[in-house]
């Protein structure tokens, strides 16, 4: 098959998944376009173990994560069940902000500066992180 | 050797099809997206699609959406390019780029020598 | 769609001079730019990716600088080879859009 069984070269390697983190920023519709051409998605953090893991390789930095709100309710771009999945929202947020004054709301979410979450306008040049799974066949036995 | 080799270009009436192919040798076909790009004669360069490794992505240009297609099948290291609806404007050479991914850059580090298709009645 | 344009349009000079080569972007795009060569008949060769870094096997008379929206290609001593046509590509955004290129003649 066409799945992979390891990391493609400058991607870490965690708990089955594969991460690139970017080091330039680019709007979250760009980014996300990046990491489609990589056979990869904008990061979609399932789990408190995962938050940690992205948060110490991004540093205090605004960065991009596969979350948004673009069509009406917040999704997912792997389509994992946002309602009942792991968040990490700073107070009060997320807020759909229409003060900074550049039109319409905030409809993509980031990594702040401590980890959590903040909506902001998609697009700012932040910084991104792409994930890709693992061949997840190989792990389990053969079907008989 | 890195190598490219496109073929399937010729003349071709407005409204009518045709399919480029472009084959790869030297790399691993399947783990890189790859491009067409253009360039009428006498004229600059034109982006026109681009495929990830899997197939599972692609982007057009505004000028070729609905008409041109990209696609490639990874058994045989090959891309492939179906133009229909092939207008005067299309003439140029296509030529096939590999894409690689440097530093959040999108570069084309590998080409092929081009294949020329003319649309004329 | 992110415009790049370039200038000049052509420029003639001899062996040994210095080129400069400029390539403008219609809105920011960072780093993401490359720089091209391509010589009548030929495919396009990369020369420099993300604005400043040299692609392996080209040779140091290349160099280039830039961020945002303004971007320079310098040829620091222009050899027999280097006449060609020289073309700007931005990756910030899909589409990617060249420049309309800058053709280096000899004088």
């Known amino acids: 098959g066409s799945e992979r069984t390891c990391c493609p070269v400058n991607w870490v390697e965690h708990e089955r998944s594969c991460y690139w983190f970017s080091r330039s920023g680019k709007a979250w519709a760009d980014a996300d376009n990046y990491c489609r051409l990589e056979d990869a998605h904008l990061v979609v953090v399932t789990s408190w173990e995962e938050q940690k893991f992205v948060q110490h390789h991004i540093g205090p930095v605004n960065t991009w994560m596969g979350l948004h709100d673009q069509n009406g309710p917040w999704k997912w771009v792997d389509g994992t069940d946002y309602e009942t999945g792991f968040k990490n929202w700073r107070p009060e947020q997320p807020d759909d902000w229409y003060g900074h004054g550049l039109g319409g709301g905030e409809d993509c979410a980031h990594f702040t500066d401590d980890g959590r979450w903040n909506d902001d306008v998609c697009q700012r040049p932040y910084r991104w992180v792409c994930e890709t799974e693992l061949d997840k066949a190989s792990q389990e036995p053969p079907l008989l | 050797e890195v190598q490219l080799l496109e073929s399937g270009g010729g003349l071709v009436q407005p409204g009518g099809s045709l399919r480029l192919s472009c084959t790869a040798s030297g790399f691993t076909f399947s783990s890189y997206a790859m491009s067409w790009v253009r360039q009428a004669p006498g004229k600059g360069l034109e982006w026109v699609s681009v495929i990830s490794g899997s197939g599972g992505t692609t982007f057009y240009a505004d000028s070729v959406k609905g008409r041109l297609t990209i696609s490639r099948d990874n058994s045989k290291n090959t891309l492939y390019l179906q133009m229909n609806s092939l207008r005067a404007e299309d003439t140029a050479v296509y030529y096939c780029?590999?894409?690689?991914?440097?530093?959040?850059?999108?570069?084309?580090?590998?080409w092929g020598q081009g294949t020329m298709v003319t649309v004329s009645s | 769609d992110i415009q790049m344009t370039q200038s000049p349009s052509s420029l003639s000079a001899s062996v040994g001079d210095r080129v400069t080569i400029t390539c403008r972007s219609s809105q920011s795009i960072s780093t993401y730019l490359m720089w091209y060569q391509q010589k009548p008949g030929k495919a396009p060769k990369l020369l420099i990716y993300a604005a400043s870094s040299l692609q392996i096997g080209v040779p140091s008379e290349f160099s280039a600088s830039g961020s945002g929206t303004d971007f320079t290609l310098t040829i620091s001593s222009l050899q027999p080879e280097d006449f060609a046509t020289y073309y700007c590509q931005q990756s910030y955004s899909i589409p990617f859009t060249f420049g309309p290129g800058t053709k280096v003649d000899i004088k």
């Open positions: 780029a590999r894409r690689i991914a440097v530093a959040g850059n999108d570069a084309f580090d590998i």
